[in-house]
Amino acid sequence: SITGISPITEYLASLSTYNDQSITFALEDESYEIYVEDLKKDEKKDKVLLSYYESQHPSNESGDGVDGKMLMVTLSPTKDFWLHANNKEHSVELHKCEKPLPDQAFFVLHNMHSNCVSFECKTDPGVFIGVKDNHLALIKVDSSENLCTENILFKLSET
């Protein structure tokens, strides 16, 4: 369970892939589309508000007691819209919704590199936001070795 309804911190950053492609958001026909693309030089990067929440680890076998905490994040590129995991379609979508946000909007934060992060679905452990065919998709990761797979690694930048 998430230990507080308020985030412990928030962070406005641009999101890019391991290979430095930008994650961009475009309003089309009253809904937002998410793209993974190379930006032209000096083109402004879209920003995402990452809200960090503390959560107890769900496993009772962890042996951590109250100290087995994880960081969960929600990602909002624009007011009232949040990234959602659509596990049925293996897709990542932007949905307009009110707080409290549904579990599909929460992602467990990992960083297997000091300068890269990964986002694991709260609703589907072992499934991560990744890049597939120039779009964001949900990608199943079978083992901890595969957590370093480039297509689930993202960079956060203030610029």
């Epitope: 911190t9 962070y11 503390e54 680890h57 962890s62 934060l109 901890s144 370093c148």
Partner: antibody, heavy 121, light 106 residues
């Protein structure tokens, strides 16, 4: 209860080697970033090395890069620091520390009591 | 590499005083900053993480603030057990400690 117990410190001559160990218990060791931090006598804290939960990535400051190697054995719940080409300025108490959260490199939530390394001829 | 400049390096204060310690980063570290307390002969202890979040069990007289490059640790009413050395620590880009602030009895 989370416990981190360092061992392996002692007196070593300049140019010599030493291997420090940290025995971890009370938590899922394989899910956490781990660290070594040192403190020279009467001085402040200095980060020495970091390692990812799976051991696949390691990080060092310039002061120890190429001389020190951090590693871990998740099956044994153990963290190690191999120190080679030791210098007088490496004399310090060496602490083992655990990340505050599962999977992320943010904050040093738990610390061992430290082991003293003295480099002197 | 990010440098963390902590000030003052030492201060003398009395029980009940309000104490403020500052930490300045050489570049933007967002809110990726902790404060640690260390007593002589003991391991450091996490006090505050992500700039302003109190670690479990830490008294509410401790508070943290700041963002970007400038950060502050405040002890609202110094208690006898608070005489110790305090360190800031950034983890936005690599890992760096500040030089420490020793809080002594006046």
């Amino acid at each position: 209860e989370v416990q981190l117990v360092e061992s392996g410190g002692g007196l070593v001559q300049p140019g010599g080697s030493l291997r420090l160990s940290c025995a971890a218990s009370g938590f899922t060791f394989s899910s956490y970033w781990m660290y070594w931090v040192r403190q020279a006598p009467g001085k402040g804290l200095e980060w020495v090395a970091s390692i990812t939960p799976d051991g696949g990535n390691t990080y060092y400051p310039d002061s120890v890069k190429g001389r020190f190697t951090i590693s871990r054995d998740n099956a044994k719940n153990s963290l190690y620091l191999q120190m080679n080409s030791l210098r007088a300025e490496d004399t310090a108490v060496y602490y083992c520390a655990r990340g505050h959260y599962y999977y992320t490199s943010y904050s040093l939530g738990y610390w061992g009591q430290g082991t003293l390394v003295t480099v002197s001829s | 590499d990010i440098q963390m400049t902590q000030s003052p390096s030492s201060l003398s204060a009395s029980v009940g005083d309000r104490v403020t310690i500052t930490c300045k980063a050489s570049q933007n570290i967002n809110k990726h900053l902790d404060w640690y307390q260390q007593k002589p002969g003991k391991a450091p202890k996490l006090l505050i993480y992500f700039t302003n979040n109190l670690q479990t069990g830490v008294p509410s007289r401790f508070s943290g603030s700041g963002s970007g490059t400038d950060f502050t640790l405040t002890i609202s009413s110094l208690q006898p057990e608070d005489f110790a050395t305090y360190y800031c620590f950034q983890y936005n880009n690599g890992w760096t400690f500040g030089g420490g602030t020793k809080v002594e009895i006046k």
